[in-house]
Amino acid sequence: VSITKCSSDMNGYCLHGQCIYLVDMSQNYCRCEVGYTGVRCEHFFL
C-alpha cells in the first residue's frame, strides 16, 4: 500500500500519533505512539 504524509490541514487528526495518507484507499490513517490505540490514537492502554 502506497503512503504519503498527511497534509498540514490534518494537524490534530491523530491525537497521539502520526497521520499518514494511504493512497490506494484514500484513507486518513493514524500510526499510533506506543501505548495508544484507536482510529485516531485516542485510547491509552497499559
Epitope: 484514500s26 484513507q27 486518513n28
Partner: antibody, heavy 115, light 107 residues
C-alpha cells in the same frame, strides 16, 4: 457492515439546482475520503471530485468545478453534492464511493433534468 | 489530464475462456491503477488496486499486471457472473480518470 445510502432518483427542472446526499454507516466516516462519480446513460464513468470528511478539504475535476459543490455533515455522517444550473447534460446517475478495502459504492442517484 | 485508453471496447467470450483487457496511460502513473467491475444492475466494485493487488473478497481468477505504460486485467477462466462492464481508473494525479470501459459479453 459498510453502507452508502443514496436516494434513488431526483427530477429537476432546467436551470435549477439539486443537492444529492450519501449517508454513510458501518465505518469511521472521517477516515475515508468520499468520491463522487458521474455516469451518463449508456456511457462510461467520470470522476467529479473527492472530499475529506474530517476537515472538508476537496479536490475537484476542473470540468466540474463550476457545476458541483461537495460538502459533508460529520454529525450525521452524510456527504452531499450540490449540482447547479442544471441542463440535459447533467442527466445521469451520480455515485458516491469510498476506496476502503473491498470498495463501497452507493446505489447511485438518477438525476433527470426535464421541464 | 491523463488519458486512459482502454481496449477492447467490447469483447465476446465463452465460459471457461481466458481473457485480457488493457489500459494504456498517456503519462506515467507509477502503478496507481485500479480495475472496476460494473454489473448490469449498476452495482460497481473494485477488483484490483495498485495495478496488481487483488481487492478483498475478489476471486483469484482475476489478476492485474503492468508492462511499461500498459496495464492489463486478466480473467483466467470466465464464469457467468463475470459478464459485465470493466473500467480502469488511474489515481496517480488529479483529476482521477477512467478508461472508456470494456463490455464483456457471453458468446
Amino acid at each position: 457492515q459498510v453502507q452508502l445510502q443514496q436516494p434513488g432518483a431526483e427530477l429537476v427542472k432546467p436551470g435549477a439546482s439539486v443537492k444529492l446526499s450519501c449517508k454513510a454507516s458501518g465505518y469511521t466516516f472521517t477516515s475515508y475520503w468520499m468520491h463522487w462519480v458521474k455516469q451518463r446513460p449508456g456511457q462510461g464513468l467520470e470522476w467529479i471530485g473527492e472530499i475529506n470528511p474530517y476537515n472538508g478539504g476537496t479536490n475537484y475535476n476542473e470540468k466540474f468545478k463550476s457545476k458541483a459543490t461537495l460538502t459533508v455533515d460529520k454529525s450525521s455522517s452524510t456527504a452531499y453534492m450540490q449540482l447547479s444550473s442544471l441542463t440535459s447534460e447533467d442527466s445521469a446517475v451520480y455515485y458516491c464511493t469510498i476506496w476502503k478495502l473491498g470498495t463501497y459504492w452507493g446505489q447511485g442517484t438518477l438525476v433527470t433534468v426535464s421541464a | 489530464d491523463i488519458q486512459m485508453t482502454q481496449s477492447p471496447s467490447s469483447l465476446s467470450a465463452s465460459l471457461g475462456e481466458r481473457v485480457s483487457l488493457t489500459c494504456r496511460a498517456s503519462q506515467e502513473i507509477s502503478g496507481y491503477l485500479s480495475w472496476l467491475q460494473q454489473k448490469p444492475d449498476g452495482t460497481i466494485k473494485r477488483l484490483i488496486y495498485a495495478a496488481s493487488t487483488l481487492d478483498s473478497g475478489v476471486p483469484k481468477r482475476f489478476s492485474g499486471s503492468r508492462s511499461g505504460s500498459d496495464y492489463s486485467l486478466t480473467i483466467s477462466s470466465l464464469e457467468s457472473e463475470d459478464f459485465a462492464d470493466y473500467y480502469c481508473l488511474q489515481y496517480a494525479s488529479y483529476p482521477r480518470t477512467f478508461g472508456g470501459g470494456t463490455k464483456l459479453e457471453i458468446k
